[in-house]
């Protein structure tokens, strides 16, 4: 018996943890950290042999309505 959409997410991809606006969510470790601990990846020079790594960084998701902007994907996540 199918369980519905929830099972599509799988155990490896839980929903991002809601951080207070003062913090940011780190997708790599899957918890909130000081935003200064996150590093936006620098683009690789053109012609690099390996593809650019996916970033594990994401701005904070706010707790509660209207407390801050929703999390936006970084270029590396697109």
């Amino acid at each position: 018996m199918r369980r519905g959409p929830r099972s599509l997410r799988g155990r490896d991809a839980p929903a991002p943890t809601p951080c207070v606006p003062a913090e940011c969510f780190d997708l790599l470790v899957r918890h909130c950290v000081a935003c200064g601990l996150l590093r936006t990846p620098r683009p690789k020079p053109a012609g690099a042999s390996s593809p650019a790594p996916r970033t594990a960084l994401q701005p904070q998701e706010s707790v509660g309505a209207g407390a801050g902007e929703a999390a936006l994907p970084l270029p590396g996540l697109l």
Partner: antibody
């Protein structure tokens, strides 16, 4: 009205322990991280650490000056924040404030005084 | 640790005067992804606890009068009071929350001339 009321301060000998409490009301306690900040007499503010909310697993961050000696915990059912202080030193003497942390330290208590002296 | 330096350490003012105070960090507090500066200002009146004035470097806290304005980006920040009132006499602290440990400046004390 937002209220944060600290208690438990007092005089303690070096090497001793003390537990501070902070009773919160007037805001959604579970939405906030809760922090402790201290201020020695006539000096600047010093952040000690904070505890995240249940949604973030009640994880904690501490300053190097208190890590391993102080422990922050919270009881969401009663909206109370705790600071357990062990191996106290003279330099821990200060007014201790609790603060609700969300956009920054949005709400502050009135403070409780701790004196470490023999 | 990020070091926050405030100047001047004290400021003698007259009521109605426009004043500015400075806060500098030894590394940038700007998170490029959301273009926010992780800097707050607090006011502490004599014998009282601190109160949040400004966060994100320029957003006023709840109930803070519009005579208080925060500005700056990166490493250099300013708090301006457009017309000082008697109730503004206090110590003003800046604080970074960009990285742990969260750190405060030593404060700027606003006193009467």
């Amino acid at each position: 009205e937002v209220k944060l009321v600290e208690s438990g301060g007092g005089l303690v000998q070096p090497g001793g322990s003390l537990s501070l409490s902070c009773a919160a009301s007037g805001f959604t306690f579970t939405d906030y991280y809760m922090s402790w900040v201290r201020q020695p007499p006539g000096k600047a503010l010093e952040w000690l650490g904070f505890i995240r909310n249940k949604a973030n697993g009640y994880t904690t961050e501490y300053s190097a000056s208190v890590k391993g000696r102080f422990t922050i915990s919270r009881d969401d059912s009663q909206s109370i924040l705790y600071l357990q202080m062990n191996a106290l030193r003279a330099e821990d003497s200060a007014t201790y404030y609790c603060a609700g942390y969300r956009n920054a330290m949005d709400y502050w208590g009135q403070g409780t005084s701790v004196t470490v002296s023999s | 640790d990020i070091v926050m330096s405030q100047s001047p350490s004290s400021l003698a003012v007259s009521i109605g005067e426009k004043i500015t105070m400075s806060c500098k960090s030894n590394q940038s507090l700007l998170y490029s992804t959301n273009q926010k500066n992780y800097l707050a200002w607090y006011q502490q009146k004599p014998g009282q606890s601190p109160k949040l004035l400004i966060y994100w470097a320029f957003t006023r806290g709840s109930g803070v009068p519009d005579r208080f304005t925060g500005s700056g980006s990166g490493t250099d920040f300013t708090l301006t009071i457009s017309s000082v009132k008697a109730e503004d006499l206090a110590v003003y602290y800046c604080q970074q929350y960009y990285i742990y440990p969260l750190t405060f400046g030593a404060g700027t004390k606003l006193e009467l001339k």
